[in-house]
Interface confidence: medium
Amino acid sequence: NQDLPVIKCVLINHKNNDSSVGKSSSYPMVSESPEDLGCALRPQSSGTVYEAAAVEVDVSASITLQVLVDAPGNISCLWVFKHSSLNCQPHFDLQNRGVVSMVILKMTETQAGEYLLFIQSEATNYTILFTVSIRNTLLYTLRRPYFRKMENQDALVCISESVPEPIVEWVLCDSQGESCKEESPAVVKKEEKVLHELFGTDIRCCARNELGRECTRLFTIDLNQTPQTTLPQLFLKVGEPLWIRCKAVHVNHGFGLTWELENKALEEGNYFEMSTYSTNRTMIRILFAFVSSVARNDTGYYTCSSSKHPSQSALVTIVEKGFINATNSSEDYEIDQYEEFCFSVRFKAYPQIRCTWTFSRKSFPCEQKGLDNGYSISKFCNHKHQPGEYIFHAENDDAQFTKMFTLNIRRKPQVLAEASASQASCFSDGYPLPSWTWKKCSDKSPNCTEEITEGVWNRKANRKVFGQWVSSSTLNMSEAIKGFLVKCCAYNSLGTSCETILLNSPGPFPFIQDNIS
């Protein structure tokens, strides 16, 4: 019995760099650290068969299946996939191990299945089996986290019922306002489900998995802060848990906090209090109001009162179904070529939306910012002064919303010309949409001042290129102008641009462009 070779099977995940689809033994550019696939000898199989751990791959992901063979001498190999033989070119690494690779670029359903690698070395023959399947991301979910009180402890548990199991982290900040942005040094992240430190200024819990990241903020009323001009509003769907934290700081411990819903004290079991001294020995008290599963009758004004602070309220609204409220009428904007401008959508939504901005079939990330009045705003400034149609799309679990914007850039026309045997056409994308004139250049009119009015056909908005209007003007050929130079001019309030065309037999026409401001 020959000594079996030492074999290592690895999976390398690649960051897609838009390489073409197909199988190849060259390497994509960017790769992650290899993952060991085990490669155990398969029991009760005829011949020597190694089986690698099953590989699950996301649609469109790029991977390399790789086998490292520690066996003396040369090796030859053959890949077989769905009864087709595939080229195999082993090479040797720095440790003189044979390396055989199969690269799968942009994984598709057709590339899923069993990959067999037959290796022949000087000593022995053996087979390695890889099973590659597409990960069923349709079953994936990422749900917004929610809070629960930990049994018998003054602590909150963060729960996100998601597939695959998400990583849960608390995002804590003790500063005010802008300094609590995610990347700020004031922000502390704790990758754990249970949080005991509940006295911070800003407390959020985030869950992340392959589908992204979702966060929930612990709704807080701070009695030491000046109340907002509009009453803070909290939306929840029937059956969701309600958590509101009331926080107050005082010079000593001689004060208490209470919660009321519509002037009635909350029932026992719907609140709990914690307190601590801050470093300067002032007392911080927090009083949580919570309902494990809200019903319609939990709607109302929740008021936190203190014996030493002015009381503050929040309006809790329980809805049957999520919503997105915003005006969906399309909006048109006209700006100068170097004018700073952002599209913006103001909306009120629950649950929080996922959104995208789209232009020219390309999607851009969408950021949202909460406003004091309960509304949120999303702005898009990355238009690079490209005219056209921009689309804002938002959705949550229960609602969808789309809003169209048209951006027009004020600029003088640029003229392009084309000609055929029977007509000449000029096109311009200047804005405001230009007007056209055609002029004939002749001995009588060397400066091309003789205007042509016969046979001219203007189309104000010929074709829409991602919302960008293009104006055109066509001159039908007549005997009177055949063989002459003609000039088409497009003009608007910002200037004029012309193109000169020689009208003769069909073929490539010389175009001479004039720019007249």
């Epitope: 906090l257 609140y271 709990f272 209090e273 001294y277």
Partner: antibody, heavy 120, light 107 residues
Framework: QVQLVQSGAEVKKPGASVKVSCKAS????????MDWVRQAPGQGLEWMGR????????TYVQKFQGRVTMTRDTSTSTVYMELSSLRSEDTAVYYC?????????????WGQGTLVTVSS | DIQMTQSPSSLSASVGDRVTITCRAS??????LNWYQQKPGKAPKLLIY???SLQSGVPSRFSGSGSGTDFTLTISSLQPEDFATYYC?????????FGQGTKVEIK
């Protein structure tokens, strides 16, 4: 004014359990933690643990874990401390003490104490 | 656990004397130290919290100082009602721990 009134003295046999009560008045019961401190005859003070009357959450000293249970009844503003599997070294005066903070405790009001004697 | 050590264990003094009791922590406890007075058969009474803050209703002859690991309770002019046992207690980290006590007796 703030008052913490404890139940009367108890004599127990080794292995038995004792439940001491502490009734609070003169302040908002759920706004202050209640701690339990004991003092063996002629000895110093020893902290046993605490309860948050608002939530019922408890923290126990490792030494007493598994033997001590602290509970509260918000309807009567009373906290209870039950100690099981009593041994002779548990003979002590047991005090409830109010503290305004969960993190940095100073005991600003104390009960009068309950003497628990464990003797066969 | 943080160990608290008081000294002296006991002292004799006369009415009008200035009395100083020290308390040392086994690690830094910032200013999270409290002082209590206990008379025989009675519950302890809070005198000083946060190392130097006088609890309301406590006479001003009592004062506290210190930070980190070393703390002092001072009675500027001993009165007859001050003869008692004094305990320090750290409130920096659980379990809260007390010093073994200092007994102030009449000389």
């Amino acid at each position: 004014q703030v008052q913490l009134v404890q139940s009367g003295a108890e004599v127990k046999k080794p292995g038995a359990s004792v439940k001491v009560s502490c009734k609070a008045s003169g302040y908002t019961f759920t706004s202050y933690y209640m701690d339990w401190v004991r003092q063996a005859p002629g000895q110093g003070l020893e902290w046993m643990g605490r309860i948050n009357p608002s939530s019922g959450s408890t923290t126990y000293v490792q030494k007493f874990q598994g033997r001590v249970t602290m509970t509260r009844d918000t309807s009567t503003s009373t906290v209870y401390m039950e100690l099981s599997s009593l041994r002779s070294e548990d003979t002590a005066v047991y005090y409830c003490a109010r503290t305004p903070s969960g993190s940095y405790s100073d005991f600003d009001y104390w009960g009068q104490g309950t003497l628990v004697t464990v003797s066969s | 656990d943080i160990q608290m050590t008081q000294s002296p264990s006991s002292l004799s003094a006369s009415v009008g004397d200035r009395v100083t009791i020290t308390c040392r922590a086994s690690q830094s406890i910032s200013s999270y130290l409290n002082w209590y007075q206990q008379k025989p058969g009675k519950a302890p009474k809070l005198l000083i919290y946060a190392a130097s803050s006088l609890q309301s209703g406590v006479p001003s002859r009592f004062s506290g100082s210190g930070s980190g690991t070393d703390f002092t309770l001072t009675i500027s002019s001993l009165q007859p009602e001050d003869f008692a046992t004094y305990y320090c207690q750290q409130s920096y980290s659980t379990p809260w721990t007390f010093g073994q006590g200092t007994k102030v007796e009449i000389k």
